[in-house]
């Protein structure tokens, strides 16, 4: 139910945190979900548990799978799941979408690119940074703590940035890389109060019980690169991630930029195996940016399967 996606490359270190929040010193047990086999805590193992962290030193493609963590106490246990995927290293330079962390935007005033997940590792400065696989050189680029600062940002600075660092565990070193896209705000652009294109306000969507259903929340925010713009779904006023119904998930659609230059975002709500109780929920498509928030509400109604008899 409470699950988190993590990914890494074979032969690199990967450290995953239990999605159940806890404080240091809490007792956390880890299991490989498919076999219910306990993951050892001894550091001599390639894969071992260390409190809230699960460590793959280094990771192998065969490690992919779902791992269960249980935050244990004498009277109340809390269970979480880590969905881990380890990919083979690419021979070419392109970093596939599935290995990318969230995109960050920058402007002349703010051009920090944080190295994703680095806080989980035992690393020492400096970080190495690459853009589209080329090592960054020149005085415009400054690696500072866990982020890269770019001076005098230009539109050409947009691209995929990879940070590379070394994780040290008991004297052994392991390489880690992480990539995210950096976009540069177009100063000629502008932002508007969000406009939701779909769904229509108070739309009734017909669904079939037992079938899958998709709802798309689509909104436009202005022209050019947008700083802080988001679309999301809520169920009964609660974020999807907090609602705790694994059948209902949201998935980012494609960022769209129409011929007229409008910047738009999609978020698809996927409901697997529609149940009666889903018809009682209120589905809110939310679009927000610095101007404010717009909400369109959808409700589901039962669609009777077509009678094929004459």
């Amino acid at each position: 139910k409470f699950s988190k996606q993590s990914w890494g490359l074979e032969n690199e270190a990967l450290i995953v945190r239990c999605p159940r929040q806890g404080k240091p010193s809490y007792t956390v047990d880890w299991y490989y979900s498919q076999t219910n086999k306990s993951i050892p805590t001894q550091e001599r193992n390639r894969v071992f548990a260390s409190g809230q962290l699960l460590k793959f030193l280094p990771a192998a493609v065969a490690d992919s799978g779902i791992y269960t963590c249980i935050v244990r106490s004498p009277t109340f246990n809390r269970t979480g799941y880590a969905n881990v995927t380890i990919y083979k290293k690419q021979s070419d330079c392109n970093v596939p979408d599935y290995l990318m962390y969230s995109t960050v935007s920058g402007s002349e005033k703010n051009s920090k690119i944080y190295c994703p997940t680095i806080d989980l590792y035992n690393w020492t400065a400096p970080l190495e940074w690459f853009k589209n696989c080329q090592a960054l050189q020149g005085s415009r680029y400054r690696a500072h703590k866990s982020f890269l600062v770019i001076d005098n940002v230009m539109t050409e600075d947009a691209g995929d940035y990879t940070c590379k660092f070394i994780h040290n565990e008991n004297g052994a070193n392991y390489s880690v890389t992480a990539t995210r896209s950096f976009t540069v705000k177009d100063e000629q652009g502008f932002s508007l109060f969000p406009v939701i294109g779909a769904p229509a306000q108070n739309e009734i969507k017909e669904v079939e019980i037992g079938k899958n259903a998709n709802l798309t929340c689509s909104a436009c925010f202005g022209k050019g690169t947008q700083f802080l713009a988001a679309v999301l779904w809520q169920l009964n006023g609660t974020k999807i991630t907090d609602f705790g119904e694994p059948r209902i998930q949201q998935e980012e659609g494609q960022n769209q930029s129409f011929s007229n230059g409008l910047a738009c975002l999609d978020m698809v709500l996927r409901i697997a195996d529609v149940k009666e109780e889903d018809l009682l929920l209120q589905y809110d498509c939310l679009a927000l940016n610095l101007h404010g928030l717009r909400r369109h509400t959808v409700r589901l109604s039962r669609k009777n399967p077509i009678d094929h008899h004459s």
Epitope: Y26, F76, K239, T241, F243
Partner: antibody, heavy 117, light 111 residues
Framework: EVQLQESGPGLVKPSQSLSLTCTVT?????????WNWIRQFPGSKLEWMGF???????SFNPSLKSRISVTRDTSKNQFFLQLNSVTTEDTATYYC??????????WGQGTTLTVSS | DIVLTQSPASLAISLGQRATISCRAS??????????MFWYQQKPGQPPKLLIY???NLESGVPARFSGSGSGTDFTLNIHPVEEEDAAAYYC?????????FGGGTKLEIK
């Protein structure tokens, strides 16, 4: 940020039932944690009363087990305390609080309840 | 039920000095290497606030002048050096078993 807010009648007559509501914002009560009721008597003594967990399981203080129920309304992100057959001994400040299996991390500001005829 | 007995019930400490509060459990609250003892601070009109978890771990955002120690049945909260804002009631609590119980409280006054 997780926030809890208690609400209730303030005054209840002896032998009646007491009903309190805790409204949680910033976090879904079905996502994690156990959601508790704790009371503090006029002399400052604190007493844990019971909880409902994120999965809907409940646990109660045996001293209250025959009188207490804790329920929830997931659509409103609220949980409730019902205490039956109250006496003047139930006069206290009632807190709702989250519990992670170890400690009570987030607390409401408390609501004062007086039992009097 | 595990009974937690706090002492003293109240104490007055000069600014900059050390305050020591004791909590004794009627049976052990430790198991599997962890001591399920917690300390809270409560100021008038406010709910309790967590200071120390698992006997000796400082909660995030709590000043380092607060420290906890102990295992089994005997636990101690130390505040050093005491500051003006530390005037409050302090409670121990265990989560070793149900029901969870609290100590009777210690009121700290700054001289």
């Amino acid at each position: 940020e997780v926030q809890l807010q208690e609400s209730g009648p303030g005054l209840v007559k002896p032998s009646q039932s007491l009903s309190l509501t805790c409204t949680v914002t910033g976090f879904s009560i079905t996502s994690d944690y156990a959601w508790n009721w704790i009371r503090q008597f006029p002399g400052s003594k604190l007493e844990w009363m019971g909880f409902i967990s994120y999965s809907g399981d409940t646990s109660f203080n045996p001293s209250l087990k025959s009188r207490i129920s804790v329920t929830r309304d997931t659509s409103k992100n609220q949980f409730f305390l019902q205490l039956n057959s109250v006496t003047t001994e139930d006069t206290a400040t009632y807190y709702c609080a989250s519990y992670d299996g170890y400690s009570f991390d987030y607390w409401g500001q408390g609501t004062t309840l007086t039992v009097s005829s | 039920d595990i009974v937690l007995t706090q002492s003293p019930a109240s104490l007055a400490i000069s600014l900059g000095q050390r305050a020591t509060i004791s909590c004794r459990a009627s049976k052990s609250v430790s198991t599997s290497g962890s001591s399920y003892m917690f300390w809270y601070q409560q100021k008038p009109g406010q709910p309790p606030k967590l200071l120390i978890y698992l006997a000796s771990n400082l909660e995030s955002g709590v000043p380092a002048r607060f420290s906890g120690s102990g295992s089994g049945t005997d636990f101690t909260l130390n505040i050093h050096p005491v500051e003006e804002e530390d005037a409050a009631a302090y409670y121990c609590q265990h989560s070793r078993e149900i029901p969870y119980t609290f100590g009777g409280g210690t009121k700290l006054e700054i001289k």
